[in-house]
């Protein structure tokens, strides 16, 4: 029961999280900005991985979307890939999970089988949360890095004057909902991991042979090769050594110096 | 890289009329606001009018009535129609912008013109 409420859980928390990274990756809101210098109006400048918006206090509101692949910084477009990434891995980790759980029978799909699929999904689960904390990270970064910055003053070859915009840069909604839903993701996948032990199977399946000498002599049955090979008439694994040999389902043997394996 | 190309300026009577106008080009992503300024000589230089991508606009309050600053975003042009022009309305105007470039479409830029003389005497 603990086992399927773990399972459960660490689906729906996983699930929530890949939503979470999915909503943090389509938003515009990934840094925020005001803009100084402006002497008309307050304007609000916030910028995503897909596009770039400008808002005014005026209710003017423009966005444009970043339509070239080759000239965006490199940062950009690894922020893109882990998120994407992500999302992929997050996708099919909940594909695989659905037919994992516990609680949904699907044909006679062993319990082994089943926390195969539920450690695979939970470690799909734990890469996408950390595709997407690393994603999140690396852009929180760059703002750090490139734009909290003092105003600069250029000068062009043609003589005009050009100088970066004071501007205050601050971590937009995105960057904390993107954190949170990898964290969400990453729990989710903990949790699916540690759901697959309880689903392994204990004992293993098969019937081992244990032979428990009942006195220091042990006398050998002819045929006895044969059996062991898999030839001759000996093939049901029938007790070939006398005194005391047992299948595990028979008896519960206990070792000690006499016995043979 | 960026131009601004301001145009428009000459000489002109005292209350005649110029129309300026300053077109951005190269790899511009966006342009948020955009503006004229002016520097008279011996003077600093000071802000004449603004305007914003959505269309506010904002004027120094000596020529509040008598100029009128208008935009078109599609052509990245900012235009400056100065009536009733003063003598002390002489200076170098300097056509200004705001804008992202493509290659960097998260930083912001001030960009100026090489400027346009007008000069106002009769």
């Known amino acids: 029961m603990a086992v399927t409420a773990c399972q459960g859980l660490g689906f729906v928390v996983s699930l929530i999280g890949i939503a979470g990274i999915i909503a943090a990756t389509c938003m515009d809101q990934w840094s925020t900005q005001d803009l100084y210098n402006n002497p008309v109006t307050a304007v609000f400048n916030y910028q995503g991985l897909w596009r770039s918006c400008v808002r005014e206090s005026s209710g003017f509101t423009e966005c444009r979307g970043y339509f070239t692949l080759l000239g965006l910084p490199a940062m950009l477009q690894a922020v893109r890939a882990l998120m994407i990434v992500g999302i992929v891995l997050g996708a099919i980790g909940l594909l695989v999970s659905i037919f994992a759980l516990k609680c949904i029978r699907i044909g006679s799909m062993e319990d082994s089988a089943k926390a195969n699929m539920t450690l695979t999904s939970g470690i799909m689960f734990i890469v996408s949360g950390l595709c997407a904390i690393a994603g999140v990270s690396v852009f929180a970064n760059m703002l750090v890095t490139n734009f909290w910055m003092s105003t600069a003053n250029m000068y062009t070859g043609m003589g005009g004057m050009v100088q970066t915009v004071q501007t205050r840069y601050t971590f937009g909604a995105a960057l904390f909902v993107g954190w949170v839903a990898g964290g969400l993701t990453l729990i989710g996948g903990v949790m699916m991991c540690i759901a697959c032990r309880g689903l392994a199977p204990e004992e293993t399946n098969y019937k081992a042979v244990s032979y428990h000498a009942s006195g220091h002599s042990v006398a050998y049955k002819p045929g006895g090769f044969k059996a062991s090979t898999g030839f001759g008439s000996n093939t049901k694994n029938k007790k070939i050594y006398d005194g005391g040999a047992r299948t595990e389902d028979e008896v519960q043997s206990y070792p000690s110096k006499h016995d043979y394996v | 890289q960026v131009q601004l190309v301001e145009s428009g300026g000459g000489l002109v009577q005292p209350g005649g009329s110029l129309r300026l106008s300053c077109a951005a080009s190269g790899s511009i992503f966006l342009i948020n606001a955009m503006g004229w300024y002016r520097q008279a000589p011996g003077k600093q230089r000071e802000l004449v009018a603004v305007i914003t991508r959505g269309g506010s606009a904002n004027y120094t309050d000596s020529v509040k009535g008598r100029f009128t600053i208008s935009r078109d975003n599609a052509k990245n042009t900012v235009y400056l129609q100065m009536n009733s022009l003063k003598p002390e309305d002489t200076a170098v105007y300097y056509c200004?912008?705001?804008?992202?470039?493509?290659?960097?479409?998260?930083?912001?830029?001030?960009?100026w013109g090489q400027g346009t003389l007008v000069t106002v005497s009769s």
């Open positions: 200004n912008a705001d804008l992202n470039l493509r290659s960097d479409p998260f930083k912001w830029y001030t960009f």
